[in-house]
């Protein structure tokens, strides 16, 4: 034991992340100690493999100790990057473990669970269209377009609640092609077109 040697301590802990599939990401970790500690990452109790183990890996252990993802990998079933991570710094005097950091993957599927259907109403009658957007994380918000332009939801006749578009009192000018739009940090998805026909 050399007098100036000391055990590791974490000086920068990783933070929770939410990242879009396919995007790069970094979980930070910095440790002090003498001798300089080695850093390893663990996810759910298992050691995370990096480019140090397999040069084809999409995860890189940076000289600072941070874990860099060239792209976040996330499939329909296999989800190797999502989870709770810790970094562990070690030297011969001991080890230090960082705080937990969760890495969540933002996704937005392609397929609408329910596409809106064509509606035919008489002038003055209420009209309702309904859609269920694709599954996503974070949960997608829903908006509507009419004839390719965002719907004017300042019109007090129009209410958007959940996946429902309600027009309490239809006018001839409400007729047109409607599309439901699901949006989150990944991007947006548009439903199939539904036609609203307003009969005189």
């Amino acid at each position: 034991l050399r007098q100036e040697d000391f055990p590791p301590r974490i000086v920068e802990h990783p933070s929770d992340l939410i990242v879009s599939k396919g995007e790069p990401a970094t979980l930070n970790c910095k440790a002090e100690g003498r001798p300089t500690p080695t850093i390893e990452w663990y996810k759910g109790g298992e050691r995370v493999e990096t480019d140090k183990d397999d040069p084809r890996s999409h995860r890189m252990l940076l000289p600072s100790g941070s874990l860099f993802f060239l792209r976040i990998v996330h499939g329909r079933k296999s989800r190797p990057d999502e989870g709770v991570y810790v970094c562990v710094a070690r030297n011969y005097l001991g080890e230090a473990v960082s705080h937990n950091a969760s890495l969540e993957v933002a996704i937005l599927r392609d397929d609408f669970r329910q596409n809106p259907s064509d509606v035919m109403v008489a002038v003055g009658e209420p009209a309702v269209m309904e859609c269920q957007p694709p599954r996503g994380h974070p949960e997608p918000t829903i908006s509507w377009k009419k004839d390719g332009s965002p719907l004017d939801d300042k019109d007090e006749r129009i209410t958007i609640r959940g996946g429902k578009l309600m027009i309490t009192y239809t006018r001839k000018s409400d007729a047109g092609k409607y599309v439901c739009v699901g949006t989150n940090m990944v991007g947006e998805r548009e439903s199939e077109v539904a036609e609203l026909t307003v009969l005189e």
Partner: antibody, heavy 118, light 105 residues
Framework: EVQLVQSGAEVKKPGASVKVSCKAS????????MHWVRQAPGQGLEWMGW????????EFPQKFQGRVTMTRDTSITTAYMDLSRLRSDDTAVYYC???????????WGQGTMVTVSS | DIVMTQSPSSLSASVGDRVTITCRAS??????LNWYQQKPGKAPKLLIY???SLQYGVPSRFSGSGSGTDFTLTISSLQPEDFATYYC???????FGGGTKVEIK
């Protein structure tokens, strides 16, 4: 190195069972689904099902339900496929394959030849 | 069940030829389509994932295209080591095409 190493060839009698193992190394075992695929002599590839090593959840096509069992031992990063009530047409090479986060089978075992003969 | 139909089932070609193999799904599978190469006595090898993405280490003469129900694998200039059997696979619910054997003319 990321690899899947399977158990050796088996010869079984009709009506018996066979258990094939697939040892994973070089990656986080619980992060990737494991599939089993078989190939009869001179034939194409046939999917037999998957196991999620994280929780042991499984799914099989109708054809194999009730006859195939898939298990895993996370402590030794090994997946197993058990096929019961063997028939001569189960003679095939059986492969384990890792499903990547890109929804494709990126790593395959070397295959295990199972011969069913009386 | 989603049925994958590959064509042709076999073809003869010469080194340097451009080779095209098609795969049709019985219903839309978006871009959940992968291509594999298999040589006798060996395990299949992933070539293309997500319809058009080239797997790490695979030569750029291999390319994939298509979405929905119709997909294509193209080998721009056939090399001696490319004589093998090729399989498409849909990962929407998982099933394989019947295979295409590429033989020397």
């Amino acid at each position: 190195e990321v690899q899947l190493v399977q158990s050796g060839a088996e010869v079984k009698k009709p009506g018996a069972s066979v258990k094939v193992s697939c040892k994973a190394s070089g990656y986080t075992f619980t992060g990737y689904y494991m599939h089993w695929v078989r190939q009869a002599p001179g034939q194409g590839l046939e999917w037999m099902g998957w196991i999620n090593p994280k929780d042991g959840d499984t799914e099989f096509p109708q054809k194999f339900q009730g006859r195939v069992t898939m298990t895993r031992d996370t402590s030794i990063t090994t997946a197993y496929m058990d096929l019961s009530r063997l028939r001569s047409d189960d003679t095939a090479v059986y492969y384990c394959a890792r499903e990547s986060g890109d929804d494709a089978f990126d790593i395959w075992g070397q295959g295990t030849m199972v011969t069913v003969s009386s | 069940d989603i049925v994958m139909t590959q064509s042709p089932s076999s073809l003869s070609a010469s080194v340097g030829d451009r080779v095209t193999i098609t795969c049709r799904a019985s219903q839309s599978i978006s871009s959940y389509l992968n291509w594999y190469q298999q040589k006798p006595g060996k395990a299949p090898k992933l070539l293309i994932y997500a319809a058009s993405s080239l797997q790490y280490g695979v030569p750029s003469r291999f390319s994939g295209s298509g979405s929905g129900t119709d997909f294509t694998l193209t080998i721009s200039s056939l090399q001696p080591e490319d004589f093998a059997t090729y399989y498409c696979q849909q990962s929407y619910s998982t099933s394989f095409g019947g295979g295409t054997k590429v033989e020397i003319k």
